[in-house]
Interface confidence: low
């Protein structure tokens, strides 16, 4: 006869491991007992359990409550056992020794491999701002046994660097993703992908990129200066910019307070029927958490009684 077993048994941390040992004998042969021991290199054999044809299963004190026979129906020639709730410390070499009648003893070894699935974590880097050089966008760390694979899935252009720290029974892998921030990256997903044999599917953690920026400000509404004459209704100035976070707008007048009747509505400055009092220098102040921009315009309200044409000055400042 001969023993049938597996070279390697792989189990995920916390699951039950079936350690197979089946005697395929000739007709009439019987199994008297199956002794299981742990036989790691450099250490003496440590008894695990004894499965006897007459008195059943005996488990060594070190494994009490953790070793069982597989559920029925059972074949008398099957010396397999279940190791409950596998832990990392269970990883190693095991031997089953089968005593048969009349053929004698047989032995076989197997390796138990306990997979420790990683619990990855993603840590965003410092706040991303347009104009920075190569900057850490995020780092992703996963520890497991064996060492997990950590990669990045993104359409954003960047560079990755990885480092690994080996511990006694596991390895921690950290991968960093660096990029040069630009506004086009806003809202783009940056996904850390962790692969490991103990995972049914890759684990993915997604970080949404936020790149702070603020575009130059400009003011619209003064394209046709001739429209800015005494009595005109509905005159307005509109401040143009864009940013992340979306900017807020504030209007002031450089040469005094805003005239009465002038309405501030976010990015728009609305005027009542124009009078010469509305002539002046108006400043749109655009800001977000990243930066601020100013754009100022000079409004000259024309008096139809006067002939002289007036020039319009547009000045932008950051």
């Amino acid at each position: 006869g001969e023993l049938e077993t597996s070279d390697v048994v792989t189990v995920v941390l916390g699951q039950d491991a079936k350690l197979p040992c089946f005697y395929r004998g000739d007709s009439g042969e019987q199994v008297g007992q199956v002794a299981w021991a742990r036989v790691d290199a450099g250490e003496g054999a440590q008894e695990l359990a004894l499965l006897h044809s007459k008195y059943g299963l005996h488990v060594s004190p070190a494994y009490e409550g953790r070793v069982e026979q597989p559920p029925p129906p059972r074949n008398p020639l099957d010396g397999s056992v279940l190791l409950r709730n596998a832990v990392q410390a269970d990883e190693g070499e095991y031997e089953c020794r089968v005593s048969t009648f009349p053929a004698g003893s047989f032995q076989a070894r197997l390796r138990l491999r306990v997979l420790v699935p990683p619990l990855p974590s993603l840590n965003p880097g410092p706040a991303l701002e347009e104009g920075q050089g190569l900057t850490l966008a995020a780092s992703c760390t996963a520890e497991g046994s064996p060492a997990p694979s950590v990669t990045w899935d993104t359409e954003v252009k960047g560079t990755t660097s990885s480092r690994s720290f080996k511990h006694s029974r596991s390895a921690a892998v950290t991968s960093e993703f660096h990029l040069v921030p630009s506004r086009s990256m806003n809202g783009q997903p940056l996904t850390c992908v962790v692969s490991h044999p103990g995972l049914l599917q890759d684990q993915r953690i997604t970080h949404i990129l936020h790149v702070s920026f603020l575009a130059e400000a400009s003011v619209r509404g003064l394209e046709d200066q001739n429209l800015w004459h005494i009595g005109r209704e509905g005159a307005m100035l509109k401040c143009l910019s864009e940013g992340q976070p979306p900017p807020s707008y504030n209007w002031t007048r450089l040469d005094g307070p805003l005239p009465s009747g002038v309405r501030v509505d976010g990015d728009t400055l609305g005027f009542p029927p124009l009078t010469t009092e509305h002539s002046g220098i108006y400043v749109c102040h655009v800001s977000n958490e990243f930066s601020s921009r100013d754009s100022q315009v000079t409004v000259d309200v024309l008096d139809p009684q006067e002939d002289s044409g007036k020039q319009v000055d547009l000045v932008s400042a950051s």
């Epitope: 806003n186 809202g187 992340q244 976070p245 707008y249």
Partner: antibody, heavy 118, light 108 residues
Framework: QVQLVQSGAEVKKPGASVKVSCKAS????????MHWVRQAPGQGLEWMGI????????TYAQKFQGRVTMTRDTSTSTVYMELSSLRSEDTAVYYC???????????WGQGTLVTVSS | SYVLTQPPSVSVAPGQTARITCGGN??????VHWYQQKPGQAPVLVVY???DRPSGIPERFSGSNSGNTATLTISRVEAGDEADYYC???????????FGGGTKLTVL
């Protein structure tokens, strides 16, 4: 995942107003502009305007100036588009779309059919 | 205001390459975005910033933009590509979004 869920179909009489809602989820509501685009039956896409969910400022297409109002409620992550003085030619599917700076639309609502008929 | 001109229709046999153009004055100076719209559905972004593809969009979809013409190219056309395609830009001078009139792609 990002979702934009719009209110249901509306039937309105000429001269009335309609208010369509668009509830955002799956992302930071105040971090992205929201646009409204409409499409008349058998016609192309027509941009109506944009709202900044953070500050509430808006820019409207010249064609709709004076008739459209876009608002938002940050507490419910919802934007609204109200169109007044409805005419039969306003019959269309109205879409909200999340704007990416650039500007393009990476996520769209499912659309709301507004029918204007006497 | 800025105008984008698309051919009303383009026909192509399966497996061939379809090219849909979008004309506009000096459009090469603008970022062009392309959307696919199938009947009864909302538009879907297929190309942005002239030639970039969102995740999930097949590599068969590509874009280019120079001079007065932007082009959406669909290689190895499949029956499922039959749809309306729209180009779009942001016109800074008018502070407005502009769509092309749309092109119906028919797979023969």
């Amino acid at each position: 995942q990002v979702q934009l869920v719009q209110s249901g179909a509306e039937v309105k009489k000429p001269g009335a107003s309609v208010k369509v809602s668009c509830k955002a989820s799956g992302y930071t509501f105040t971090g992205y502009y929201m646009h409204w685009v409409r499409q008349a039956p058998g016609q192309g896409l027509e941009w109506m305007g944009i709202i900044n969910p953070s500050g509430g400022s808006t820019t409207y297409a010249q064609k709709f100036q004076g008739r459209v109002t876009m608002t938002r409620d940050t507490s419910t992550s919802t934007v609204y588009m109200e169109l007044s003085s409805l005419r039969s030619e306003d019959t269309a599917v109205y879409y909200c779309a999340r704007g990416r700076l650039g500007t393009y639309f990476d996520y769209w609502g499912q659309g709301t059919l507004v029918t204007v008929s006497s | 205001s800025y105008v984008l001109t698309q051919p009303p229709s383009v026909s192509v046999a399966p497996g061939q390459t379809a090219r849909i153009t979008c004309g506009g004055n000096n459009i090469g100076s603008k970022s062009v975005h392309w959307y696919q719209q199938k009947p009864g559905q909302a538009p879907v972004l297929v190309v942005y910033d002239d030639s970039d593809r969102p995740s999930g969009i097949p590599e068969r979809f590509s874009g280019s933009n120079s001079g007065n013409t932007a082009t959406l190219t669909i290689s190895r056309v499949e029956a499922g590509d039959e749809a309306d395609y729209y180009c779009q830009v942001w016109d800074r001078s008018s502070d407005q979004v502009v769509f092309g009139g749309g092109t119906k792609l028919t797979v023969l």
